[in-house]
């Protein structure tokens, strides 16, 4: 069966350029190794933002230089993307792969539109 992946339609990043959303998948099998990838779709181009592989029951770990962090709980992954600016506004797609044991399963969410608004610079204050 096809694996369903759910994620929110829209998220607004904080003034500090941080956006968080939940990616939830309905696992057709009993996977012990899962890979989660965040993709960004801009126009017709899809690029990888970050990826992490984790063992079920363990925390997922992104690379040290990744702009993503996350926690996992069962079939749910809480993803946080940081360092976002207005130009990063776009559709962020959650891709889930059940890697082990075979068979492999792929699930791709419909995407979360993340809106990022750059903060206004603070005006100079006279004291």
């Amino acid at each position: 069966k096809a694996m369903h992946v759910a994620q929110p339609a829209v998220v607004l990043a904080s003034s500090r350029g941080i956006a968080s959303f939940v990616c939830e998948y309905a696992s057709p099998g009993k996977a012990t190794e899962v890979r989660v990838t965040v993709l960004r779709q801009a126009d017709s181009q899809v690029t990888e933002v970050c990826a992490a592989t984790y063992m079920m029951g363990n925390e997922l770990t992104f690379l040290d230089d990744s702009i993503c962090t996350g926690t996992s709980s069962g079939n749910q992954v809480n993803l946080t993307i940081q360092g976002l600016r207005a130009m990063d506004t776009g559709l962020y797609i959650c891709k889930v792969e059940l890697m082990y044991p075979p068979p492999y399963y792929l699930g791709i969410g419909n995407g979360t539109q993340i809106y990022v608004i750059d903060p206004e610079p603070c005006p100079d204050s006279d004291f």
């Epitope: 069966k1 096809a2 369903h4 993709l39 890697m99 492999y104």
Partner: antibody, heavy 118, light 107 residues
Framework: QVQLVESGGGVVQPGRSLRLSCAAS????????IHWVRQAPGKGLEWVAA????????YYADSVKDRFTISRDNSKNTLYLQMNSLRVEDTAVYYC???????????WGQGTMVTVSS | DIQMTQSPSSLSASVGDRVTITCRAS??????LAWYQQKPGKVPKLLIY???TLQSGVPSRFSGSGSGTDFTLTISSLQPEDVATYYC?????????FGQGTKVEIK
Amino acid sequence: QVQLVESGGGVVQPGRSLRLSCAASGFTFSNYGIHWVRQAPGKGLEWVAAIWYDGNNKYYADSVKDRFTISRDNSKNTLYLQMNSLRVEDTAVYYCARNGVLGAFDIWGQGTMVTVSS
Amino acid sequence: DIQMTQSPSSLSASVGDRVTITCRASQGISNYLAWYQQKPGKVPKLLIYAASTLQSGVPSRFSGSGSGTDFTLTISSLQPEDVATYYCQKYNSSPWTFGQGTKVEIK
């Protein structure tokens, strides 16, 4: 540019072995799963094997399980297919193909011909 | 394992005709379906993924539709360069199965 180039095909006798290679260039090899797909003369496409990212996860078609081994060397941007106990029915053009970020096979090599004949 | 069945196995149509090829999965695969074109003596080429999304550079006369078990590839106006064999493929899980192919010729 993005490309895959296969090599190592040839004529072998049944029961013998052969190793195919697929050299990748123009993209970050370790970020992609790569497949072997074959096509017997005048026939359709048949998926053979796949290997993911760091090489720890491998998948095989039932027709080649326990005879073929897929592997990769990310430092050399190269994919391999070790084919043992070859059979006449393994005669085909063997293609390597990249698993695109959204799941379909978006880049294919030019293929290498393997003929198993006595 | 999920089986992929294409129909027809071959067809002949005139230039400018609308051509439709169908692909049926033995179980639901959502929209995890791709279509490939293989011209005689050439390498397969990705045309459509996610059942209906056109791969970059593919002419707009090609379109795909369907979800679940039934899918369609349509060529709105057949051109001489479209002579090829077309394959559907499911990619939601291993094994990555192809349909048996549909050979398209010009009358």
